[in-house]
């Protein structure tokens, strides 16, 4: 939620006997972080550790295969999106620890908090691309045999990244640092000031393009894929269903609180009690969305273990099996194991 969403304690209890010293907190509670902020910090720490290590490993595994394996291209791009977002976490973590004080300057304020939105759009667009690929493999195998290649996959990824950057621009442009007079604090957020309509438009576009439309299209897409898969009695269809549900669900589950509070805040009066309550929950909603940045490697590993019984292989080789297996298109009606399995992997980044 891009609004200035940081709440500080009220200072209504002074009398003339109090001493107002900038070097010591005047409010008794001002050194204590709120529970939502503490939870956000815990989530950020876990996401950073798992996200950086896990996605770095995924990048390392897929980078070597990306020249020849289309699935590796998809997973490489998703991992890069996640990895980039995770790099902002130490700064966001530091800011929350300092009660949302932002000592990092205007440029960092514009760029770093926007990374999670870039991740959201890049991931959902890449996911849409991957889903289209899965769909074509099932329903247009001949076309895939003729045209499905690494070059086209890279072009599709480039288009996804370009669109993601475009969609992130509004939030990026409206991000500003504001120095509050008392308590002395620099805050980083977006300020639409006179333009409440534009704020609402940005929130609606984000909800529709980053959540509702993908939810609808991906649900339809995977419904068709799974129906076809079942009708052909493809192997591992039950396992596939479970993983695909996990895959699609995770993106929407982890973005849901952010999207709901974001749209609500854009329609509420900024001084209303509900708005102020939602502001207090903002860091938690952002951190919850950030879970998407570390969930991919976890699902890859879980899926890899599931498909191979027990974890006998090393982590890189297990990931290599899951992420770089190429879908072989056959003219026969049978649906290949790799098509089912790779579809089953977590293909969402955010």
């Amino acid at each position: 939620m891009d609004s200035f969403n940081y709440t500080t304690p009220d200072y209504g209890h002074y009398d003339d006997k109090d001493t107002l010293d900038l070097n010591t907190p005047v409010d008794k509670t001002s050194n204590t972080l709120r529970v939502p902020d503490i939870l956000a910090l815990v989530i950020f720490a876990v996401v950073f550790l798992v996200g950086v290590l896990g996605n770095a490993l995924v990048v390392w595994v897929t980078a070597f295969e990306a020249k020849r394996t289309i699935n590796a291209i998809w997973f490489l791009n998703l991992a890069v999106a996640d990895f980039l977002s995770c790099l902002a976490l130490p700064i966001l973590f530091t800011s929350i620890v300092q009660h949302h004080h932002w000592p990092f300057g205007g440029a960092a304020c514009s760029i770093l908090p926007s990374l999670i939105l870039l991740n959201m759009y890049a991931s959902i667009l890449l996911l849409a691309t991957i889903s289209a690929d899965r769909f074509l493999l099932v329903f247009k195998p001949i076309w895939c045999q003729n045209f499905r290649g690494a070059g086209l996959a890279w072009i599709a990824c480039a288009v996804a990244w370009g669109l993601a950057l475009l969609l992130t621009i509004p939030s990026f442009l409206y991000r500003v640092v504001r120095e509050e007079y008392f308590p002395p604090k620099v805050l980083c957020g977006v300020d639409y000031s006179h333009d409440k309509r534009r704020e609402r438009a940005v929130a609606i576009v984000r909800l529709v393009l980053g959540f509702l439309w993908p939810l609808l299209t991906l649900t339809i897409c995977y419904t068709f894929i799974l129906l076809r898969t079942w009708s052909r009695r493809a192997t591992r269809s039950t396992k596939t269903l479970k993983v695909v549900v996990a895959v699609v669900a995770s993106f929407f589950i982890f973005w849901l609180p952010y999207q709901v509070t974001g749209i609500m805040m854009s329609f509420l009066e900024p001084s209303s009690p509900t708005f102020l309550l939602l502001k207090k929950l903002d860091s938690l909603c952002v951190s919850f969305a950030y879970i998407n940045c570390c969930i991919n490697p976890i699902i890859y590993v879980v899926a890899g273990q599931g498909f191979q019984g027990r974890l006998r292989k090393s982590l890189p080789s297990l990931l290599r099996n899951v992420l770089t297996e190429e879908s072989v298109v056959r003219e026969s009606k049978s649906f290949t194991r790799s098509t089912v399995d790779t579809m089953a992997q977590k293909t969402q980044a955010v």
Epitope: L20, P184, P270
Partner: antibody, heavy 125, light 112 residues
Framework: QVQLQQSRAALAKPGASVKLSCKAS????????LHWVKQRPGQGLEWIGY????????KYNQNFKNRATLTTDSSSSTAFIHLSGLTYEDFAVYYC??????????????????WGQGTILTVSS | DVVMTQTPLSLPVSLGDHASISCRSS???????????LHWYLQKPGQSPKLLIY???NRFSGVPDRFSGSGSGTDFTLKISRVEAEDLGVYFC?????????FGSGTKLEVK
Amino acid sequence: QVQLQQSRAALAKPGASVKLSCKASGYTFTNHWLHWVKQRPGQGLEWIGYINPINGFSKYNQNFKNRATLTTDSSSSTAFIHLSGLTYEDFAVYYCARVPLSYGGSYGPYFFDFWGQGTILTVSS
Amino acid sequence: DVVMTQTPLSLPVSLGDHASISCRSSQSLIHSNGNNYLHWYLQKPGQSPKLLIYTVSNRFSGVPDRFSGSGSGTDFTLKISRVEAEDLGVYFCSQSTLVPLTFGSGTKLEVK
């Protein structure tokens, strides 16, 4: 009662420096921040900065940062503003103003409840 | 910096009339604690400014109830229900949400 006593007038040459004073009485001097505000003839008000008398912490408007220095002397309950490199643009009335710690349910030192009567600074060669 | 724009610059009134002064800020004045730190001062000729209204709508001690303030975010209004002779002077709005603190250019309330 609370009073902020300022010298009536000051005269200085362009390029010179001047130190204006503001003597507080009627309250505990170290308990309230003191702000300085500039008003050019027939113009609006411009905030210069504030000082916290208990620890000498001061915050400035960037427009004045290099030319204004705020200090206090707790023993005499007096605040000072030192203006250097004076130009004709500095010809103005300078007010000191106090912020409350609390007033009727407000939150912190946000508004000026008492003002000095102002010092007219004339810059002339 | 937050620019405070007051309208009108001059407001001719008859005594007993209702008066309204508008103040618009270039940025939202909503503090992170939810308050709008927008205040109103009156300056009479040859005097220092005096506080009338603080934090949008709170009357300072001794200020008559004919003065009222309202607004939020970027748009604020000071209303005087029945103008009296002692109300004449220049009215300034001021914000203390953000650094630097800034003032409006002033509205001169004068007799028609």
